[in-house]
């Protein structure tokens, strides 16, 4: 945007200037693009609740398990196994957690009446020795229990193990118990509450409704608003075995999804329950598969404080809110509208791909000529010489000829480097049509001229006899009426052109050439036409009627106004323009460009 | 799994030399300890040089400054140089590999047969005039 000068300046609008094609096939092709969009766009504002405002759920959950299982340990006693039955209640079973999860064991091992004092490691690849050299006083492995002493005892029998400070016996390294010793912890059940809030939209719910029957049982299809789970249902919602997972243990989601729409018209918000698996369910043994940790139940004991290890393998739910709350908002249906209204540009740019596609060189000179049902195409010619102006950077070096025997233009964009601008090739550039509406701007005079005695009416033609070659016109003169330039030797190719490019008849022998270009009444008239009051001394006025005759000239033959503009005057053209309209001293300055 | 082969036993004159070499497979072979163990007819197993995967080297007792133990990780080998050797060092060589990739092997450690999960099936060694 250009700078502003002045208080008008901002006070000004701008818009762009279209060409409207009537086409049925670009026509449908626009409203197929819009129909397609505007679809979108409605669907896409409904389905997505675009229009609403919508904030994230901020939630609390409070939980309560309950069940009873049954459990039948099995115990040594003196060397004997005994088989103990033992009932355990969701105070046995459940572990206080924090954050919004629950924890429910299934199974366990037990290390009972272990206290502090020295004794020989449980044998394993690490504890096992055959002299002290294996044990290292002080000592402490990170996968051991207790502080090495240094020495190498016996553990049972011929094994021998490294003697640690430790609580004692030592914990076995053994397997949990298959099936899970709480097995039964399939058919306990979880009644989740969970409270839920958009302090944005000032809304708070929760998932159990007044009216609720706390009898039920959530199921997927048959009862979705149930708040109450039972564990083993949880298990097969996610494709797994309840009794497997009990054995090592795992964690398990329990998601509650809240999408809300609390617009007065279409109001809905309750939860929606789904569950994952979260722990890795094929990890390798030796990176810890399930789920287990360990506490211990501390007692005296004759005055000695002992413990009852005890390494619980369970299943840890999480409970994952989630979801938003949308309320109608207009600036974001205005803020939606506007980012879609760009969508509706595409018709335009796909439009225009196929007009630039069609019109391409290409086109014209492979696809054209050889393929019949693509000639209806070629009406993209047409449409793109509308919709585009063509213009040429104006470098120092741009010059346009026009050679009365040839039908187009040359465009010479490149330095001379002294060779004669008669024998520059160029690049072919077709001839702008004329404006006739330009000539109702002459005088009179020019439309009906008097015939001159001698010479019948009709169009004069060029003369068709070659004009003899002077002997002073130079080398590249093909109409015999060129002068050499008197422009430095640096310059002198410039000039060096003719007004044919083949040899033949001058144009300034042009009956058109006296009226339009030579003509003093015309070219004073066009002079007052610019400027009404003009009143001239005659050097300043012969000045200005020579380069406005350089200007009628140029276009008269290069009919463009950025043509005539870079246009190169044959050297006949200028020397007999400058012999009716003569400068009274000094040298003529020859073609400056104009940028 | 890492399959262990031993190589280079043979008959040796007392104060001669002999390299015997372990060759591992396997692509985790650098997350080993290695260690050469021997057992003479009639005895225990003995330990005599082992090597862990960041390349700390322990030596049995009877065979320090006389055997040398290293490792080629490029080409998954393990050769112990035995120079001076005498005829109480008559017996089946063993290599064994101890996997550190969960922890290393503590150094003290190194000579306990039972640190070594994989064993090879040995090549003899005799010495003998």
């Known amino acids: 945007m250009p700078a502003c000068c002045s208080c008008s300046d901002v006070f000004q609008y701008e818009t762009n200037k279209v060409t409207r094609i009537q086409s049925m096939n670009y026509g449908t092709i626009k409203w197929f693009f819009h129909v397609i969009i505007f679809s979108y766009v409605c669907f896409a504002l409904v389905s997505d609740k675009l229009y609403q405002r919508k904030e994230p759920v901020i939630s609390s959950v409070h939980t309560k398990v309950k069940g009873i299982a049954e459990v039948k340990e099995e115990i040594v006693e003196n060397g004997v196994k005994k088989l103990v039955h033992s009932v355990f209640d969701t105070a046995d079973y459940t572990f206080p957690l924090q954050g919004n999860s629950f924890f429910v064991m299934t199974n366990f091992l037990k290390t009972e009446g272990q206290e502090q004092r020295l004794c020989p490691e449980y044998p394993t690849r690490r504890t096992l020795c055959s002299s002290d050299r294996g044990c290292k006083k002080g000592w402490m492995d990170p996968q051991s229990k207790g502080i090495q002493t240094g020495r190498c005892v016996v553990y049972e029998g011929n094994q021998k193990t490294c003697e640690v400070s430790a609580w004692c016996p030592i914990e076995a390294v053994e397997e949990a118990p298959r099936p899970a010793l709480l097995n039964s912890a399939e058919n306990f059940t979880v009644l989740i509450k969970n409270n839920i809030d958009f302090p944005g939209h000032n809304y708070t719910t929760r998932n159990i409704l007044p009216g609720l029957n706390i009898t039920c049982t959530f199921h997927k299809t048959q009862n979705p608003q149930c708040p109450i789970f039972r564990l083993g249902d949880i298990f097969r919602e996610t494709g797994d075995n309840f009794s497997d997972v009990a054995i090592q243990g795992g964690i398990m989601g329990i998601e509650i999804y809240w999408d809300c729409n609390l617009d007065r018209w279409f109001h809905h918000c309750r939860p929606k329950y789904s569950f994952r698996r979260l722990d890795d369910k094929t990890t390798n043994v030796s990176l810890y598969p399930g789920y287990n940790f360990r506490y211990a139940k501390y007692y005296k004991e004759n005055n000695v404080e002992k413990r009852t290890l005890i390494k619980v393998f369970g299943i840890r739910f999480d409970i994952l809110v989630f979801g938003t709350g949308g309320k109608f908002d207009i600036i974001q249906l205005v803020v939606y509208i506007g980012s879609t209204l760009s969508y509706f540009g595409l018709a335009a740019v796909f439009i225009d791909f196929l007009i630039d596609t069609y019109s391409s060189n290409c086109c014209r000179s492979h696809i054209y000529p050889w393929c019949k049902c693509c000639q209806p195409c070629v009406v993209n010619e047409y449409y793109y010489r509308k919709k585009c102006e063509s213009i040429v950077e104006p470098k120092p070096t741009l010059k346009y000829v026009s050679f009365v025997d040839e039908s187009h233009i040359r465009m010479v964009n490149q330095q001379l480097l002294g060779r004669s601008l008669q024998d520059v090739k160029g690049q072919e550039v077709p001839r702008p049509a004329m404006d006739f509406t330009d000539l109702s701007r002459l005088p009179l005079a020019l439309h009906d001229t008097p015939p001159i005695p001698g010479q019948p009416e009709e169009i004069q033609l060029l003369r068709k006899e070659a004009t003899p070659r002077s002997r002073d016109s130079p080398v590249w003169c093909q109409c015999g009426s060129c002068l050499p330039s008197q422009l430095p030797e640096s310059h002198r190719c410039l000039e060096e052109l003719c007004c044919r490019k083949k040899p033949g008849a001058c144009i300034t022998t042009s009956e058109l050439f006296r009226k339009l270009v030579l003509s003093r009444h015309v070219l004073q008239f066009l002079l007052l036409y610019q400027e009404p009051l003009l009143a001239l001394d005659v050097d300043s006025t012969n000045s200005r009627l020579r380069h406005c005759a350089y200007r009628c000239y140029a276009t008269w033959r290069f009919g463009s106004q950025d043509m005539a503009d870079f246009a190169i005057l044959p050297s006949c053209c200028r020397w007999r323009i400058r012999k009716e309209f003569p400068k009274s001293e000094g040298q003529y300055s020859g073609f400056k460009s104009p940028y | 799994e890492v399959q262990l082969v031993e190589s280079g036993g043979g008959v040796v004159q007392p104060g001669g030399s002999l390299r015997l070499s372990c060759a591992a497979s396997g692509r985790t072979f650098r997350h080993y300890a290695m260690g050469w163990f021997r057992q003479a007819p009639g005895k225990e197993r003995e330990f005599v040089a082992a090597?862990?995967?960041?390349?700390?080297?322990d030596y049995g007792d009877s065979v320090k400054g006389r055997f040398t133990i290293s490792r080629d990780d490029a080409k998954n080998t393990v050769p112990l140089q035995m120079n001076s050797l005498k005829p109480e060092d008559t017996a089946l060589y063993y290599c064994?590999?101890?996997?550190?990739?969960?922890?290393?092997?503590?150094?003290?450690?190194?000579?306990?047969?039972?640190?070594?999960?994989?064993w090879g099936q040995g090549t003899l060694v005799t010495v003998s005039s």
């Open positions: 090597i862990s995967s960041y390349g700390s080297t």
């Open positions: 064994a590999a101890a996997d550190e990739t969960l922890g290393a092997v503590p150094n003290f450690r190194l000579h306990e047969k039972y640190e070594y999960e994989y």
